[in-house]
Interface confidence: medium
């Protein structure tokens, strides 16, 4: 019973003793099998470009690194891989920690290895909670919201033997990081005359050419196609002035399962160049393009227990397929297509990145004609299936698209079949000239449940069965709101602190659910929250008719300082669990520690006369016009629809670097609302930027990055997706 290091840990409970022979056989000192061994044993050279699942599938099994008790529970098209490390408070890697899934025992478990690392496969698209347990430490839980088909690098987890209270901090004065990320340019460039210009300046690539006598074929060489050519990421973490009291700057870069971590003493113009060797965490070559997640954290002297993190994504180029296999040389007329990544590697040295070309738009449902209100043939193939008034959208954790189509909520399965799952009944329908009764949909990433925020009935509903039922109108239950309207200065504070089903609401609109299952919804000028126990509270605003406060133009505010005028839509960013609010042509971000800042749009009081705010590339200096809906992708990209119902009907995107650009919806040269001869539908199966939309009412993003638009005026659901090679029936 010896505590050698004075760290309170005795015998084999202490990971430092695990190297001693007496502890070698202790379960606390043994981890799961090393994934590197498993992958390398089962590695095949063909095909060079494997699907994500094929790269990692060997890691799960009865005798693998991720132990599954029964049948393989994973969907090959949805899986992701969680990688992380567990350490003790002094930074010692912790072996023998059992890591399992809360609520999903069939997903199995793993045990951290000697270096404290672990690997777990899970179905993505959903939010999962991991449970960490090892004697004598306090067990912990961590929630992760997983994308599809990618690695998820979890922050290092520190296990403690006792709970120590973290003092609360006033964050209102702290400046958050605003890193600038520049990745090395994609190697699209090549020199037409290598003899004269052997170096491609943008990428520092050496280029050579040899003519083959007696033929019109040339041999070409590019140093960028060699194994030693790495991808670079330049990260600027601080600007010329450093915020007051900033003591340390933390950096994390996650790419293909690698997690790089470093911390720096605070200083001006702090920069770091991250070098990626184009392999994944298991040493497998990565072909095509990969998303790197860069996190920069600020640690302040007055609040050492808290690091303020900001995340950005950047694109890094992996290995290129070699068309000719001639020791780094290729025949200039011999090309090879990476179908999975959508890259054409030419023998000339040029690369054509199809996914970097403008996105493509298609119609996945609707044909421009309205269905009848009774919806007799609502079920079947989605394509061409008529709609009445698509007003709300949400994406399910399996990739299903839920469509709020006036009086029916309809589910488009990944198979592209559609089924009605809820009928919304109202005697008023027969008196309505405007079928766009507005309600909002949201999916809980934890349970997959679908919620309906209905302004008219002042209630929030949960759909009971997502696969449909005979009783479509009875397929919902109230989760918030009595139907009674909460009036200003209500003594009961509209039910705050009590059960949400007993609360009174004012005017529920946009709704979103975060990775922990907390539901947020707009209620008049407030944003309200329902916790996992069904208790309601107000996150932002009040019902006391307090005057709207002008938003801070360029600095963050505490949530208690903010009073909104007319918020409409909400979205949660899966990357950092922050809540985004659409309010009067401005999009606000509320971080998990309740700091509010503008992400896109320029409030009127912040605009300087004489400056054209429609031209700015920066989202926070760009004016939004009649913004109608927002959504956020798993890579943190914000999407905004704007419509004046006349000439402006578009979708714009804001990257994690804060740049805004048009993604879909060309300006119409006539008035879609008032001119009956104005053609406001066009562009399917072509570039989305050239397509014409008509009153886009709602937005949703799937985990694979496909953006769905409820094109209300055109009575269609449009899908905007990356430009990729299309395979025929023979997979060619």
């Amino acid at each position: 019973n010896k505590d050698n290091e004075g760290d309170g840990l005795v015998d084999c409970l202490d990971p430092d003793c695990c190297l001693q022979s007496a502890c070698q056989n202790s379960l606390l000192c043994r981890g799961s099998r090393d994934p590197l061994d498993i992958i390398q044993q089962g590695q095949t050279d063909w095909p060079a470009v494997k699907s994500f699942y094929d790269r990692i599938k060997l890691l799960a099994g009865k005798d693998s690194t991720h132990i599954i008790p029964g049948e393989n529970p994973f969907n090959s098209s949805l899986v992701s891989l969680i990688r992380g490390q567990v350490v003790t408070t002094d930074g010692t890697p912790l072996v023998g920690v059992n890591v399992s899934f809360v609520k999903y025992p069939k997903y199995g478990y793993t045990i951290t290895r000697q270096d404290g690392t672990f690997d777990l496969i899970a179905n993505g698209g959903a939010s999962l909670t991991l449970h960490f347990e090892r004697a004598p430490f306090m067990s912990q839980e961590r929630t992760v919201w997983l994308p599809w088909n990618s690695f998820y690098a979890m922050d290092t987890l520190v296990m403690k033997t006792e709970e120590n209270s973290i003092p609360s901090c006033d964050l209102s004065g702290f400046v958050r990081p605003d890193p600038i990320i520049i990745s090395s340019p994609l190697s699209t460039f090549f020199s037409a005359a290598p003899g004269q210009n052997p170096i491609v300046p943008e990428t520092q690539v050496l280029h050579e050419e040899i003519e083959l006598p007696g033929s019109n074929v040339k041999l070409r060489y590019l140093s960028s196609r060699t194994a030693g050519y790495k991808s670079l990421l330049k990260i600027t973490m601080t600007q010329s002035t450093v915020p007051l009291n900033l003591i340390r700057v933390h950096l994390m870069v996650a790419v293909e399962g690698h997690l790089f971590q470093k911390s720096f003493q605070a200083s001006p113009n702090l920069a770091y160049t991250f070098i990626w060797d184009k392999t994944d965490a298991y040493g497998q070559r990565v072909y095509g393009l990969s998303d790197a997640v860069v996190s920069v954290g600020f640690e302040y002297e007055t609040c050492p227990s808290l690091i303020l993190w900001e995340k950005r994504t950047a694109l890094l180029q992996g290995f290129e397929l070699d068309p000719s296999n001639l020791g780094g040389w290729s025949l200039d007329k011999h090309h090879i297509l990476n179908v999975k990544s959508g890259i054409l590697h030419k023998g000339t040295g040029e690369n054509q990145f199809l996914t970097q070309q403008p996105a493509i738009i298609t119609s996945i449902m609707g044909n421009g004609r309205r269905r009848s209100i009774s919806c007799p043939s609502c079920n079947g193939l989605a394509e061409g299936n008529k709609l009445l008034a698509p007003v709300a959208l949400a994406v399910g954790i399996d990739g299903s698209l839920y469509v709020g189509d006036f009086n029916y909520i309809r589910r488009i399965f990944p198979s592209r079949n559609v089924t009605s799952i809820l009928e919304l009944r109202n005697k008023e329908f027969k008196h309505s000239n405007n079928p766009a009764h507005k309600y909002y949909l949201a999916v809980d990433p934890v349970s997959g449940s679908l919620y309906v925020s209905d302004t008219n009935s002042r209630r929030i509903y949960r759909v009971k069965s997502l696969s449909g039922t005979k009783d479509l109108a009875g397929n919902s239950e109230v989760v918030a709101g009595t139907g009674e309207q909460c009036l200003p200065f209500d003594e009961a504070r509209c039910g705050d602190g009590g059960k949400a089903i007993d609360a009174t609401l004012m005017s529920p609109r946009g709704i979103a659910v975060d990775k922990n299952g907390l539901m947020y919804f707009v209620d008049a000028t407030m944003i309200r929250k329902v916790d996992q126990n069904g208790i309601i509270s107000t996150l932002l605003g009040s019902n006391d008719l307090t005057a709207v406060r002008p938003l801070s133009c360029d600095s963050s505010m505490d949530v208690a300082q903010v009073r909104l005028e007319w918020p409409t839509d909400l979205a949660v960013n899966p990357m950092d669990n922050s809540l985004y609010v659409l309010e009067n042509n401005v999009i606000l971000r509320i971080t998990e520690n309740h700091q509010v800042s503008i992400i896109a749009g320029r409030p009127m009081h912040c605009q300087v006369p004489g400056i054209d705010y429609s031209l700015s590339k920066l989202a926070i200096h760009s004016a939004l016009e009649s913004a109608s809906a927002i959504a956020i992708s798993h890579t943190g990209v914000l999407y905004i629809t704007e419509t004046d119902e006349k000439k402006i009907n578009r979708l714009r995107q804001v990257t994690t670097n804060g740049e805004i650009c048009l993604l879909a919806g060309a300006a119409s040269d006539c008035d879609c609302k008032n001119d009956v001869n104005c053609n406001c539908y066009s562009g399917d199966d072509a570039y989305a930027t050239d397509a014409i939309l008509n009153s886009p009412s709602s937005l949703a993003v799937a985990p694979d990055g496909t953006i769905y638009i409820a094109d209300l005026g055109n009575i269609r659901i449009r899908a905007v997706s990356k430009n990729k090679p299309v395979l025929n029936a023979f997979n060619q």
Partner: antibody, heavy 123, light 107 residues
């Protein structure tokens, strides 16, 4: 508390009209439908129609079409049901009842009822 | 119009008895069925909505079930205050229609 208070009993001659009032309190009047239901002595309940106090929209049972008019005065939170061309078989207790109007989900039933107004039609 | 029928039209029971009343619709009404209790000289009182949901404030001894065309109201243990007339009502489509009622009296 939430309640509906109706006007007092009426005695009318055949061919006349009667107008029954229903005053709401304890809740937001414009948020909920008002339904009218009648019950002849010793008989069952008979639904006459509904009115949305917010929009003024109405829906009447075919049997009463052309004879019944449902209106409201939102400023005094009162709904009215007027039945014309009265006949002896219209003798009944007339109830107003609250239903969850303004909602997609209108099938929740009538959760608050007035005390009833007795209308007697007799020559 | 949708016709509603109830059975039995009356029944005699004792305190503590389990009582079941059946309501039938002339066509499928999904689960749009409500149950009311009415005592002599009083207005009806909503007990159950959408076939099986208990109205707040109603004792848990009352329960409802069924969908489509056949529905039941069950009182698990009859109490003295439960002697009354019970009506079913469909709200699937207008005109809303009531059943003729079932009178529960003392045995």
């Amino acid at each position: 508390q939430v309640q509906l208070v109706q006007s007092g009993a009426e005695v009318k001659k055949p061919g006349a009209s009667v107008k029954v009032s229903c005053k709401a309190s304890g809740y937001t009047f414009t948020n909920y439908d008002i339904n009218w239901v009648r019950q002849a002595t010793g008989q069952g309940l008979e639904w006459m129609g509904w009115m949305n106090p917010n929009s003024g929209n109405t829906g009447y049972a075919q049997k009463f079409q052309g004879r019944v008019t449902m209106t409201r005065n939102t400023s005094i939170r009162t709904a009215y049901m007027e039945l014309s061309s009265l006949r002896s078989e219209d003798t009944a207790v007339y109830y107003c009842a609250r239903g969850p109007g303004g909602s997609f989900y209108y099938y929740y039933g009538m959760d608050v009822w007035g005390q009833g107004t007795t209308v007697t039609v007799s020559s | 119009d949708i016709q509603m029928t109830q059975s039995p039209s009356s029944l005699s029971a004792s305190v503590g008895d389990r009582v079941t009343i059946t309501c039938r619709a002339s066509q499928s009404i999904s689960s749009y069925l409500n149950w009311y209790q009415q005592k002599p000289g009083k207005a009806p009182n909503l007990l159950i909505y959408t076939a099986s949901s208990l109205q707040s404030g109603v004792p848990s001894r009352f329960s409802g079930s069924g969908s489509g065309t056949v529905f039941t109201l069950t009182i698990s243990s009859l109490q003295p205050e439960d002697f009354a007339t019970y009506y079913c009502q469909q709200s699937s489509s207008t005109p809303f229609t009531f059943g003729p009622g079932t009178k529960v009296d003392f045995k």
